[in-house]
Amino acid sequence: GPVWRKHYITYRINNYTPDMNREDVDYAIRKAFQVWSNVTPLKFSKINTGMADILVVFARGAHGDFHAFDGKGGILAHAFGPGSGIGGDAHFDEDEFWTTHSGGTNLFLTAVHEIGHSLGLGHSSDPKAVMFPTYKYVDINTFRLSADDIRGIQSLYGDPKENQRLPNPDNSEPALCDPNLSFDAVTTVGNKIFFFKDRFFWLKVSERPKTSVNLISSLWPTLPSGIEAAYEIEARNQVFLFKDDKYWLISNLRPEPNYPKSIHSFGFPNFVKKIDAAVFNPRFYRTYFFVDNQYWRYDERRQMMDPGYPKLITKNFQGIGPKIDAVFYSKNKYYYFFQGSNQFEYDFLLQRITKTLKSNSWFGC
């Protein structure tokens, strides 16, 4: 199922139930999000205006989706899995009597369950799990997620120690030699390697220890921060940069006009909303696009996807996956795959990992 592809997630309370004080609603919702942030790398922040990832709504009857509420009892609430628009939103039936305690329906407990759905969890068959489909009051002061809930959410997002790998909320320059440093995208550009992270990129000139940090906007003012994938076709002096469902073409280090364009022009199906990583192999003249736990192969000569894709990363790149953050091609036989703070040198002729490194090993740390 879908997951959020970022770790900083915003929520907004669209309206308040008259059953409770506003502060109690705010507190119940905040604590419900905290239950999930305590066991994952996710960070939640409340916003009061604008488009949030997760919209919390109290409504009765028909309320703008295909799932009208049914009056008191029955369906208490529902939530949509991660995605744009209605994706992630949590709806609470206003015909219930929402409370901070055991009377009526406890908002905190219901919200923990619904936020689980908002994050991509389905129902659990374990009656002790908060994701079990039926509501049962438990003491909120001693409430704990079950092992099944934790297993489920960590299978989607990992555990909290991955917090250190996240983009800085203040967008300050990441510490280059932080052992937990991860990258958003990596690509060669001629004899240099570009490492992208948030608003920044590091430039590594091959075989030289010195690296310099730059703002992406200082080199390419028209490009966004948070580049998610990148690859180079050196013979054409072209670099492709990807963010969300758009890509930019850089020729001879200059952005081409009439970009960005949609990634769907490569032939991706509509459900692909972003690219995690990409790499061009000049030997085969093919580009590999990594999306979630799958990859596509694109024929750069014929300008079309090869048939038979997508394929599972783990099936065809032994020891890599299920997902990757970045990848680049080097020395005519290696892919360097980045997964969080780890990096894997992968010999594509032998089809195996030949070295495991830290992601920032290129910087003499």
Partner: antibody, heavy 122, light 103 residues
Framework: EVQLLESGGGLVQPGGSLRLSCAAS????????MSWVRQAPGKGLEWVSR????????GYADSVKGRFTISRDNSKNTLYLQMNSLRAEDTAVYYC???????????????WGRGTLVTVSS | DIQMTQSPSSLSASVGDRVTITCRAN??????LNWYQQKPGKAPELLIY???SLQSGVPSRFSGSGSGTDFTLTISSLQPEDFATYYC?????FGQGTKLEIK
Amino acid sequence: EVQLLESGGGLVQPGGSLRLSCAASGFTFSWYNMSWVRQAPGKGLEWVSRISPSGGDTGYADSVKGRFTISRDNSKNTLYLQMNSLRAEDTAVYYCAKDIRGAYSGGLFDYWGRGTLVTVSS
Amino acid sequence: DIQMTQSPSSLSASVGDRVTITCRANQSIYTYLNWYQQKPGKAPELLIYAASSLQSGVPSRFSGSGSGTDFTLTISSLQPEDFATYYCQQAGIFGQGTKLEIK
């Protein structure tokens, strides 16, 4: 490439029955909500029915409730609409539409078929 | 029940014009509103979802705005291929449509 191809339309007498099919390809059919939407000649769009990915959850417009039944066969990548007790006002082009979402449906249709014409007349 | 009222029902404009179509719900639908374009004899095509998000492949001259009960679709500079009928939609409810014709 996502493709939806409706079939089964035609001329039928009032009170008669018809079964529409929609063959889907180019996406994982069993992951998505699907809907039928119709358009009477010269009129606007009217949502008719929807079905969840597993087929366990369905919904209908009031105008067809009790007369139409939506179903799907995920092994055949096919969506169906069984239409009984047809009336003149059911005359329309019937479109099969793919919802952008699995699980709960927000009713956002990113792909549509070309439609099949159903004419109810004596 | 939720109802959607679209206006105007028809509109004449020229190539290069800026055009606005509005859609009003009788109760809040948050940002759960979509816009479709339909050309004669063709199936509808998704233009805008979640009130303001542009569907991939749709030209940037199309934009959407609004939340709650009032929504607008704007075409910043009409092109010949934009003459069509436009529908707003929320779950199982469509607006009546706006036919955009050449002046």
